[in-house]
């Protein structure tokens, strides 16, 4: 049975979703974004350590193998599972535009 | 502009599509499927430098954030970005099942 | 915290002008988008535009292109929205929002009423 | 531009009882979608955006779901305070537009 949301490591180790403060010059959009001028960076960050928040049968074969051969295969990786949408206001050739990303901010995570 | 796949570190050492030969008892799998015995597991394995097969704009966040601040930051990660379906026959109360799973060998990989 | 108040009721006549003002405090004025939205009796909310404090780019509604005009003046933390042509239909609030994030208006003036009769 | 359709144009609710708002968009949105309240001689305040993520200070008895064109908002145990006309908004192109509104009167 999956243990889930229990870090065995300790708690906020494992793998969560952390939100990082960044301005557009961090980000490197400086010469191309105008709006927001900061933004909340929601990402991914942590250890996933065996059964823990398991995206799919590939992280749980992924586990198997990573502990009987750590040099070869590397351990499930703490990514995004969903995103929260963003609205960005970019500097184009004629003036400015109004630009949607659904792929930009994490909004929770899990290992594969 | 994106370097896409060219990998900047040397042939092979970026995140790309390796495959492992398993074992049932490799995977784990040994008490509960009876075929296939052994599976060639393709998994995402590599480093993900700069602008290498980035999966979108998460990822490119994501590498500029761990080229500012590498301790904070993980850079990204080498992940299926698809998969390749596959069938297992399992054991089960009754006797057998045919299973197919949707999520268990990765067919091309990106960096999260 | 962020204040946004804007300049006082105007009485305007069919083809004058009108200019709004709306001054922010509370925060660094180059910090937050201001958009411009407006509200007939007993209407709905209609956007006018959006503009960029830092450098004054700004952005129209096409269905007020060439008769509205932003601009902001940096040095007083204020951005006024002027309206020219005027007619009847143009009686309304109007409201400055200052926006953090492009997509939303989180803080708002207290509205500024422009009637428009002869 | 987007047309928000908003319904219903009125809704009578007893305090304590779960009020559901509606707004349809005339093509797929995604999530950027936000929704106000006004009451009268006020300003419009933020209350979802989103379409479902909260803002600090709302009442978590406010909450929203829907994407692509249908979007809801939910008051799950009405207040006397919570009366007024709610707008939602959408940003997923320019101009923005808001939907005409639904009057939420306190029976």
């Known amino acids: 049975a999956r243990n889930g949301d229990r870090c065995p490591l300790g708690p906020g180790r494992c793998c969560r979703l952390h939100t990082v403060h960044a301005s557009l010059e961090d980000l490197g959009w400086a010469d191309w974004v105008l709006s927001p001028r900061e933004v909340q960076v929601t990402m991914c960050i942590g250890a996933c350590p065996s059964q823990f928040r398991e995206a799919n049968m590939h992280a749980q074969i992924k586990m198997n193998l990573h502990r009987l051969k750590p040099d070869t295969v590397p351990a499930p990786c703490c990514v995004p599972a969903s995103y929260n949408p963003m609205v960005l206001i970019q500097k184009t050739d004629t003036g400015v535009s109004l630009q949607t990303y659904d792929d930009l901010l994490a909004k929770d995570c899990h290992c594969v | 502009a994106r370097n896409g796949d060219r990998c900047p570190l040397g042939p092979g050492r970026c995140c790309r599509l390796h495959t492992v030969h398993a074992s049932l008892e490799d995977l784990g799998w040994a008490d509960w499927v009876l075929s296939p015995r052994e599976v060639q597991v393709t998994m995402c394995i590599g480093a993900c430098p700069s602008q290498f097969r980035e999966a979108n704009m998460h990822a490119q966040i994501k590498m500029n954030l761990h080229r500012l601040k590498p301790d904070t930051v993980p850079a990204p990660c080498c992940v299926p970005a698809s998969y390749n379906p596959m069938v297992l026959i399992q054991k089960t109360d009754t006797g057998v099942s045919l299973q197919t799973y949707d999520d268990l060998l990765a067919k091309d990989c990106h960096c999260v | 915290q962020v204040q946004l108040v804007q300049s006082g009721s105007e009485l305007k006549k069919p083809g004058a002008s009108v200019k709004v003002s709306c001054k922010a405090s509370?925060?660094?004025?180059?910090?937050?988008?201001i958009n411009w939205v407006r509200q007939a009796p007993g209407q709905g909310l209609e956007w006018i535009g959006w503009?960029?404090?830092?450098?004054?780019?700004?952005k129209y509604n096409e269905k007020f292109k060439g008769r509205a005009t932003l601009t902001v003046d940096t040095s007083a933390s204020t951005a006024y929205m002027e309206l020219s042509s005027l007619r009847s239909e143009d009686t309304a609030v109007y409201y400055c929002?200052?926006?953090?994030?492009?997509?939303?208006?989180?803080?708002w003036g207290q509205g500024t009423t422009v009637t428009v009769s002869s | 531009e987007i047309v928000l359709t908003q319904s219903p144009a009125t809704l009578s609710v007893s305090p304590g009882e779960r009020a559901t708002l509606s707004c349809r968009a005339s093509?797929?949105?995604?999530?950027?979608l936000h929704w106000y309240q006004q009451k009268p001689g006020q300003a419009p305040r933020l209350l979802i955006k989103?379409?479902?993520q909260s803002i600090s200070g709302v009442p978590d008895r406010f909450s929203g779901s829907g994407s692509g064109t249908d979007f809801t908002l939910k008051i799950s145990r009405v207040e006397a305070e919570d009366f007024g006309v709610y707008y939602c908004?959408?940003?997923?192109?320019?101009?923005?537009?808001f939907g005409g509104g639904t009057k939420v009167e306190i029976k």
């Open positions: 929002a200052g926006t953090y994030d492009p997509a939303y208006f989180d803080y």
């Open positions: 509370g925060y660094t004025f180059t910090s937050y988008d």
């Open positions: 503009i960029y404090p830092r450098d004054g780019i700004s």
């Open positions: 093509q797929s949105i995604s999530y950027y």
């Open positions: 989103y379409a479902s």
């Open positions: 908004q959408q940003s997923n192109s320019w101009p923005y537009t």
